[in-house]
């Protein structure tokens, strides 16, 4: 099995995690993709997923999680906005390819969210003109439920994360709780 590597990201409450997961566009452009959390001793749980088939650059919002799948660039963008301490944990991007096991996109993200004022710009932040507007017509996709083995033998591409906290306020409307749907029974 492939060694699972992870990168640690330490953020403050209220900041945004911005993750970019690369994939082979010719293979997986229209495949359904998901953002999962891995808790100690448990199977990965899906927090949000794209539609099936995945739509190009069409945002899907589940609570404070926004997924955008860019087919032309072979990239899944995952944002977790207004982070809370309880969001701390280990995350990963996966590509669903039933009946085969999910294709995992490494590296896993070790997210550590701490309390504290997040108003001071971080090293990855950009200008005051950076604004996040979450579209009001985002879609909530239904994530599949199916059993899959624990092991992954194929070495996939990697993912990475970026901290992004625009000075402008993040305006989320009609936000629901994060849905945690287990992918593995």
């Amino acid at each position: 099995a492939t060694k699972l590597t992870e990168e640690k990201y330490e953020l403050k409450e209220g900041q945004t995690l911005d993750v970019k997961c690369d994939y082979t566009l010719e293979k997986f452009a229209s495949s359904q993709k998901a953002w999962q959390i891995i808790r100690d001793g448990e199977m990965p749980k899906t927090l949000a997923c794209t539609e099936r088939p995945s739509k190009n650059s069409h945002p899907v919002q589940v609570g404070r999680i926004i997924l955008e799948d860019y087919h032309d660039h072979g990239l899944l963008r995952v944002r977790m906005v207004n982070l809370q301490v309880e969001d701390s944990g280990l995350y990963q991007c996966v590509i669903y390819q039933p009946p085969k096991e999910p294709h995992m996109l490494f590296d896993r993200i070790r997210l550590v969210v701490t309390k504290g004022f997040s108003g001071t710009p971080g090293s990855n932040e950009n200008s005051t003109q950076n604004v996040y507007k979450i579209p009001p017509t985002t879609t909530k996709a239904l994530c599949p439920l199916y059993t899959s083995p624990r092991t992954v033998t194929q070495a996939p591409p990697k993912s990475t994360a970026d901290v992004s906290t625009p000075d402008s306020e993040i305006n989320l409307t009609n936000v629901t709780d994060i849905i945690r749907v287990p992918v593995f029974n």
């Epitope: 970019k20 963008r77 990855n124 950009n126 200008s127």
Partner: antibody, heavy 117, light 107 residues
Amino acid sequence: EVQLVESGGVLVQPGGSLRLSCAASGITFSNSWMSWVRQAPGKGLEWVANIKQDGSEKYYVDSVKGRFTISRDNAKESLFLQMNSLRAEDTAVYYCARGGISTFDIWGQGTMVTVSS
Amino acid sequence: EILMTQSPATLSVSPGERATLSCRASQSVSSNLAWYQQKPGQAPRLLIYGASIRATGIPARFSGSGSRTEFTLTISSLQSEDFAVYYCQQYKNWMYTFGQGTKLEIK
């Protein structure tokens, strides 16, 4: 045919302003992040700015923040770069490129901006 | 800002031989790295994204490898049209940066 065509590059004095335009065709412009990348004579590539499909996110390299503004008109399939307070170090070929969420997969042929007195 | 450093600045290789270009990031960019080719008077062309995934239409002789901070672009058997300048680019954070370029010339 997929095409990005830049225009607006001229000789301008330091402190002056300029607006670059990029006309897109053959791509789904309204679905694409777009960017400006520049290249000073004999030098390497430098990303300048990018903009999301709906204009809701814009990012800039530090050296142009507060001076340059990226914008777009999806109805006209056009990308713009408003350049104010120009400096000699802004002299470069400016490329319009599709992308900005990650890579730049389609490029124009560039327009030359010269800042000199 | 993530600094991207390419080496060597110039690489002289004979046609048919193998060329290996390196790119180092000042901090981890995971797999968020791309390679471009640029010929004189032309716009750059995307070759590789995700550190190792060939862009559409790119010949199989081009391959990318590496992750985090160390990356390599390999051209297995150089063709005459491959002599150009090659740039790496990271897109991990929103302050995108390119390497200074490696000029691949005919030996």
